[in-house]
Interface confidence: low
């Protein structure tokens, strides 16, 4: 997977003159239509409710630090997280919960109950996703909490558990 | 949360001359790359199958009226709705259904069955989402129907039930 | 539904001079901000694990061939698939799986277990979705595999089973 570094913000680039001179194609390519995105897979070994992610995923205009995506350009972001669970049912139902946090505050969560029959059964699969559309400032952090992180299937399906964002509209 | 009003359509702005004069940065910022979006949370008190939404959410280039999002700029829109249900299982299974309507016609729906063991159990959580990518004209309405609206969890998880859209490509 | 053919790549269009001359609006409309998208519904009759799609859906800058979406412009794509299942429960649980393939390789999958009570019951509905954000080159193929394709509900809910993509950021 490619890891892109973010170019200098086009706002710092003279839009007329300089290397671009009168070349409109060049000018347009340096125009204020920033793009920022990330697509990270969950870390193989999880040991706490705040999930960790593989930082060798796709990162462009966004930093990753200590389980957080850190915003570098302000704007309206589309955020989506999807997790694959694998539960060996005990003799009671299990509630799986995915929490999306912005600056450590829970902004959105998704819940689903599995093993509702209350019987000890073979493994039960469940897929859970959550999205958010929100204005984010520079240095805003995005993270994910899962109480039942031990049920996230990082072994059979390591690629299925992802946190992704993209900048829809910048604040220029 | 911020509520943006839509600026004048850039098509009405002279792209050459006027205030912008020869300033390409100014020109580009008023260029024909419209953005429209909405992110609304469900109303606290639901009393019919057609859901109502809190109009104090994010609205930009889209109007909200009587349970409908109303399109102001034609184009290709990405629409996504997500609902969090909480069901006290009766002694039979329950089908939860989410319908996305465009101009009062059902365009897409998602169904999931809960309480399938047929036993009266504790509360069961279920999360349901639905998306659509469609060309929408000016004044097109978008709404959501849920037969089992009484199971939508507006009390424990008031922020989890959202209808969101964004303009992907305008029709210019 | 509209089917768009892709215009000539704007890179082949002189950005200065030619028909556009000094008309910035014209120039901007032909600027290097490509848009490509697709929204296809599943074919009515499925007979193999690799799903087929109705090619009369929305296609713009993407081709459809033999169950594959074929990329025409390189870039970062958002891909999302959603399927509606209807299962007549046997006397054991059933695992429903949706696999997203890029160039015939499984890139992402979602699983959910239904009929977990192990009882023969009435029909059970389940909705499953999967997304991906990935860099795709020209001629890359996108397809979907479902082992239990016989459970995909193409009769009651023919519009609910979709594969959709859109180009988020081109590679120019």
């Amino acid at each position: 997977q490619r890891t892109d570094s973010i170019p200098n913000s086009p706002d710092n680039v003279p839009l007329k003159g300089g290397n671009c001179s009168e070349d409109l194609l060049c000018i347009l390519k340096r125009a204020p239509f920033k793009k920022s995105w990330a697509y990270l897979q969950v870390a193989k070994h999880l040991n706490k409710t705040k999930l960790s992610w593989n930082k060798d995923g796709i990162l462009h205009g966004v930093r990753y630090q200590d389980g957080n995506l850190v915003i570098q350009f302000p704007g309206l972001y589309f955020i989506i997280c999807q997790l694959q669970f694998l539960v060996q049912c005990p003799n009671n139902s299990v509630d799986l919960k995915l929490e999306l946090l912005i600056n450590k505050h829970i902004k959105k969560q998704a819940l689903v109950t599995v093993c509702e029959s209350g019987m000890q059964t073979k493994h039960v699969y469940q897929n859970l996703s959550q999205f958010l559309l929100d204005y984010l400032q520079v240095n805003t952090t995005i993270s994910v909490n899962v109480d039942t992180f031990q049920y996230i299937d990082t072994s059979t399906f390591p690629l299925e558990n992802v946190l992704s964002i993209f900048l829809y509209s910048n604040s220029d | 949360q911020r509520t943006d009003s839509i600026p004048n359509s850039p098509d009405n702005v002279p792209l050459k001359g006027g205030n912008c004069s020869e300033d390409l940065l100014c020109i580009l910022k008023r260029a024909p790359f419209k953005k429209s979006w909405a992110y609304l949370q469900v109303a606290k008190h639901l009393n019919k199958t057609k859901l109502s939404w809190n109009k104090d959410g994010i609205l930009h280039g889209v109007r909200y009226q009587d349970g409908n999002l109303v399109i102001q700029f034609p184009g290709l829109y990405f629409i996504i709705c997500q609902l969090q249900f909480l069901v006290q299982c009766p002694n039979n299974s329950v089908d939860l259904k989410l319908e996305l309507l465009i101009n009062k016609h059902i365009k897409k729906q998602a169904l999931v069955t809960v309480c399938e063991s047929g036993m009266q159990t504790k509360h069961v959580y279920q999360n349901l989402s639905q998306f659509l990518l469609d060309y929408l004209q000016v004044n097109t309405t978008i709404s959501v129907n849920v037969d089992t609206f009484q199971y939508i969890d507006t009390s424990t998880f008031p922020l989890e039930n959202v209808l969101s859209i964004f303009l992907y490509s305008n029709s210019d | 539904q509209r089917t768009d053919s892709i215009p000539n790549s704007p890179d082949n269009v002189p950005l200065k001079g030619g028909n556009c001359s000094e008309d910035l609006l014209c120039i901007l409309k032909r600027a290097p901000f490509k848009k490509s998208w697709a929204y296809l519904q599943v074919a009515k009759h499925l007979n193999k694990t690799k799903l087929s799609w109705n090619k009369d859906g929305i296609l713009h800058g993407v081709r459809y061939q033999d169950g594959n979406l074929v990329i025409q412009f390189p870039g970062l794509y958002f891909i999302i698939c959603q399927l509606q299942f209807l299962v007549q429960c046997p006397n054991n649980s059933v695992d429903l799986k949706l696999e997203l393939l890029i160039n015939k390789h499984i890139k992402k999958q979602a699983l959910v277990t239904v009929c977990e009570s192990g009882m023969q019951t009435k029909h059970v509905y389940q909705n499953l979705s999967q997304f991906l954000l990935d860099y795709l080159q020209v001629n890359t193929t996108i397809s979907v595999n479902v082992d239990t394709f016989q459970y995909i509900d193409t009769s009651t809910f023919p519009l609910e089973n979709v594969l959709s993509i859109f180009l988020y950021s081109n590679s120019d």
């Epitope: 000890q120 073979k122 493994h123 992180f149 049920y151 299937d153 990082t154 072994s155 | - | -």
Partner: antibody, heavy 119, light 106 residues
């Protein structure tokens, strides 16, 4: 370093009970399931059950219901298995093993506790 | 419960020889794990989820299979590989192990 330290060998009389321990170190005890496995000469490995110290959830093999009771003490990062109504059939080596995630992969094992039931 | 049958029960191989042992399940399983055990020691995780090598396991080991048939292969036998190997299924409860294949050095 992840380690599971098991209690020493036990010689017990038939009909009595025994409680063996498994002390975890080098990782967050409450974040992983812990399993117990029995090994008798010529009988291979038999799974007894698992416990999740984070919420005391446990699963067990029907064959060992009434025989094995699994508990855990968060404060000392120790898991326990009590074996009751002992017979010669219970003479075996008992291993505790950490379970990776929820995938029932026994990734780290204790050295084993030998239980001998004899009159 | 799912019964796992390992074969052969005992086998011997010379250094450098290719070794294959199998594990057959009484009904279909998703994945298989393998453990190595030497006399007087606890079992060690060797291969997990059918084909992933545990940390420190030499690359000469490999695992494969699906459904009811799984195998462990050593491309070139070495003296240190002499041990008993157990397969274990994780697809349904109770978790079960095979009776083991004892691999001896010829």
């Amino acid at each position: 370093r992840v380690q599971l330290q098991q209690s020493g060998a036990e010689l017990v009389r038939p009909g009595t009970s025994v409680k063996i321990s498994c002390k975890a170190s080098g990782y967050a005890f409450t974040n992983y399931w812990l399993g117990w496995v029995k090994q008798r000469p010529g009988h291979g490995l038999e799974w007894i059950g698992d416990i999740y110290p984070g919420n005391y959830n446990s699963y067990s093999n029907e064959k060992f219901k009434g025989k094995a009771t699994l508990t855990a003490d968060e404060s000392s990062s120790t898991a326990y298995m009590q074996l009751s109504s002992l017979t010669s059939e219970d003479s075996a080596v008992y291993f505790c093993a950490r379970i990776y995630g929820n995938y029932w992969i026994f990734d780290v094992w204790g050295a084993g506790t030998t239980v001998t039931v004899s009159s | 419960q799912i019964v796992l049958t390992q074969s052969p029960a005992i086998m011997s191989a010379s250094p450098g020889e290719k070794v294959t042992m199998t594990c057959s399940a009484s009904s279909s399983v998703n994945y298989m794990h393998w453990f190595q055990q030497k006399p007087g020691t606890s079992p060690k995780l060797w291969i997990y989820s059918t084909s992933d090598l545990a940390s420190g396991v030499p690359a000469r080991f490999s695992g494969s299979g699906s459904g009811t048939s799984y195998s462990l292969t050593i491309s070139r036998m070495e003296a240190e590989d002499a041990a008993t190997y157990y397969c274990q299924q994780r697809s349904s409860y109770p978790l079960t192990f095979g009776a083991g294949t004892k691999l001896e050095l010829k």
